[in-house]
């Protein structure tokens, strides 16, 4: 058993039929010695008396809020949560496996630049009685500070008969050095509690590996005289690291017809302009990627040829 936060404890249980469970001793936080009784949740049934209560925790029915009382007055509470281990593996019932980029991916994280700021998100089908707490650090043995905000519900989607909920959190490395070579990964830890079930999820990454620039901005077309060609121009996104001479992007320019089946013309360039042929009813799209490190491409910025 360990303390998650004040008066909240996690009991780690091997979860199999007829498992013996864990013996837990609860101590009433009071100077009183006599006349103390214990109850669980809203029940008025007295579970025991005395300053300590010894219980065998085997299942969810044994978890919950234990309260010690004296003469009708509440003295203290202890909330017991369960963390299930099945076949040697901690349960992952609360979050959905996003399966990208690989199986057992519960947390996904992205950064728009090298500032040390990043966003992580996760999915669940659970809509109520759910709390998340996020901690992060650079390295684990001698951790350097990363500050995370509160997780918030960022999207709700319908998947068949069920809804799916996306939560996200923003974190910022306290002493980020954008130009430095990373040697220790960022660690992100999410504590998830649904009712009386505790689970934890972790992700480890280098900022350079989760970079995904915003799309290029101010995408414009300039027709060239006496030609079907146009000059496409754009700018670095505002959120990208500066100076651009050091934090450089490369770009992919694509001409796409109305039909998805039509052949796409693609041009790769390090410049912020390109000359392409604009077909009728086509659109021109541009996306960006770190020039020197193959992390994710940005989403497309698009304009119609017309």
């Amino acid at each position: 058993i360990w303390e998650l936060k004040k008066d909240v404890y996690v009991v780690e249980l091997d979860w199999y039929p007829d498992a013996p469970g864990e013996m837990v001793v609860l101590t009433c936080d009071t100077p009183e010695e006599d006349g103390i009784t214990w109850t669980l949740d809203q029940s008025s049934e007295v579970l025991g008396s005395g300053k300590t209560l010894t219980i065998q925790v085997k299942e969810f029915g044994d978890a919950g809020q234990y309260t010690c009382h004296k003469g009708g007055e509440v003295l203290s509470h202890s909330l017991l949560l369960l963390h299930k281990k099945e076949d040697g593996i901690w349960s992952t019932d609360i979050l959905k496996d996003q399966k990208e980029p690989k199986n057992k991916t519960f947390l996904r994280c992205e950064a728009k630049n090298y500032s040390g700021r990043f966003t992580c998100w996760w999915l669940t089908t659970i809509s109520t009685d759910l709390t998340f707490s996020v901690k992060s650090s650079r390295g684990s043995s001698d951790p350097q500070g990363v500050t995370c905000g509160a997780a918030t519900l960022s999207a709700e989607r319908v998947r068949g008969d069920n809804k799916e909920y996306e939560y996200s959190v923003e974190c910022q490395e306290d002493s980020a050095c954008p130009a430095a070579e990373e040697s220790l990964p960022i660690e992100v830890m999410v504590d998830a509690v649904h009712k009386l079930k505790y689970e934890n999820y972790t992700s480890s990454f280098f900022i350079r590996d989760i970079i995904k620039p915003d799309p290029p901005k101010n995408l414009q077309l300039k027709p060239l005289k006496n030609s079907r060609q146009v000059e496409v121009s754009w700018e670095y996104p505002d959120t990208w690291s500066t100076p651009h001479s050091y934090f450089s992007l490369t770009f992919c320019v694509q001409v796409q017809g109305k039909s998805k089946r039509e052949k796409k013309d693609r041009v790769f360039t390090d410049k912020t302009s390109a000359t392409v042929i604009c077909r009728k009813n086509a659109s021109i799209s541009v996306r960006a990627q770190d020039r020197y490190y193959s992390s994710s491409w940005s989403e497309w910025a698009s304009v119609p040829c017309s």
């Epitope: 949740d41 809203q42 299942e59 969810f60 029915g61 019932d93 089908t125 659970i126 809509s127 109520t128 009685d129 069920n162 809804k163 909920y165 649904h194 009712k195 079930k197």
Partner: antibody, heavy 116, light 108 residues
Framework: SVEESGGRLVTPGTPLTLTCAVS????????MIWVRQAPGEGLEWIGI?????NTYYATWVKGRFTISKTSTTVDLKMISPTTEDTATYFC??????????????WGPGTLVTVSS | FELTQTPSSVEAAVEGTVTIKCQAS??????LSWYQQKPGQPPKLLIY???KLATGVPSRFSGSGSGTQFTLTIGDLECADAATYYC???????????FGGGTEVVVV
């Protein structure tokens, strides 16, 4: 205690509001549920309203009902009832432990008959 | 999400024992309650958290199970136990909520 009212005979398409009046506890502490039971059938949950006022509906509801509350009542509005909505409608109070809860205080029910 | 109750009807003698099963289509941990309903009356809570007896309910009623399989057992049957019994999952309103189809208990 909780007690439902407002059930009556209505023609199809006529909106109807059922009211659940509560006493002896505060709606700001408990989840409330509306459940219905067609004649000779089982229990079917319609929706719940949490202590903070958030509403959650069964997937089949699809905008046919809305739940709201005041400090002492919980309303179920039937937007455009059909004959399939003929049932006894129950209001019940949760235990206070959770939003998705079990229910330990039930009203006697109010009968809604939808017929032309 | 589905809660399947079996059997739909059962007949048993006074002082006998009845077992009703409730199966969830996905794990709901121990978030299951049982209700008794008599004709013309609202449901009455018997069991919550799969196995905890509600206030004032005789110990002849007991609940067990977790995950997807749950059981309500009524021992030492009395004529007053003739009723319909419903299980209810309260895991989450989006991801596992609702009532089983009911089991009618006839006491002879």
């Amino acid at each position: 205690s909780v007690e439902e009212s407002g059930g009556r005979l209505v023609t199809p398409g006529t909106p109807l509001t059922l009211t659940c009046a509560v006493s002896g506890f505060s709606l700001s502490d408990y989840t409330m549920i509306w459940v219905r039971q067609a004649p000779g059938e089982g229990l079917e949950w319609i929706g719940i309203i949490s202590s903070s006022g958030n509403t959650y509906y069964a997937t089949w509801v699809k905008g046919r009902f809305t739940i709201s509350k005041t400090s002492t009542t919980v309303d179920l509005k039937m937007i455009s009832p059909t004959t399939e909505d003929t049932a006894t409608y129950f209001c019940a109070r949760g235990s206070g432990a959770y939003i998705s809860d079990y229910f330990n205080v039930w009203g006697p029910g109010t009968l809604v008959t939808v017929s032309s | 999400f589905e809660l399947t109750q079996t059997p739909s009807s059962v007949e048993a003698a006074v002082e006998g024992t009845v077992t009703i099963k409730c199966q969830a289509s996905q794990s709901i941990d121990s978030w299951l309650s049982w209700y008794q309903q008599k004709p013309g009356q609202p449901p009455k809570l018997l069991i919550y958290a799969a196995s905890k007896l509600a206030t004032g309910v005789p110990s002849r009623f007991s609940g067990s199970g977790s995950g997807t399989q749950f059981t309500l057992t009524i021992g030492d049957l009395e004529c007053a136990d003739a009723a319909t019994y419903y299980c209810q999952s309260y895991y989450d309103v989006n991801a596992g909520y609702g009532f089983g189809g009911g089991t009618e208990v006839v006491v002879v």
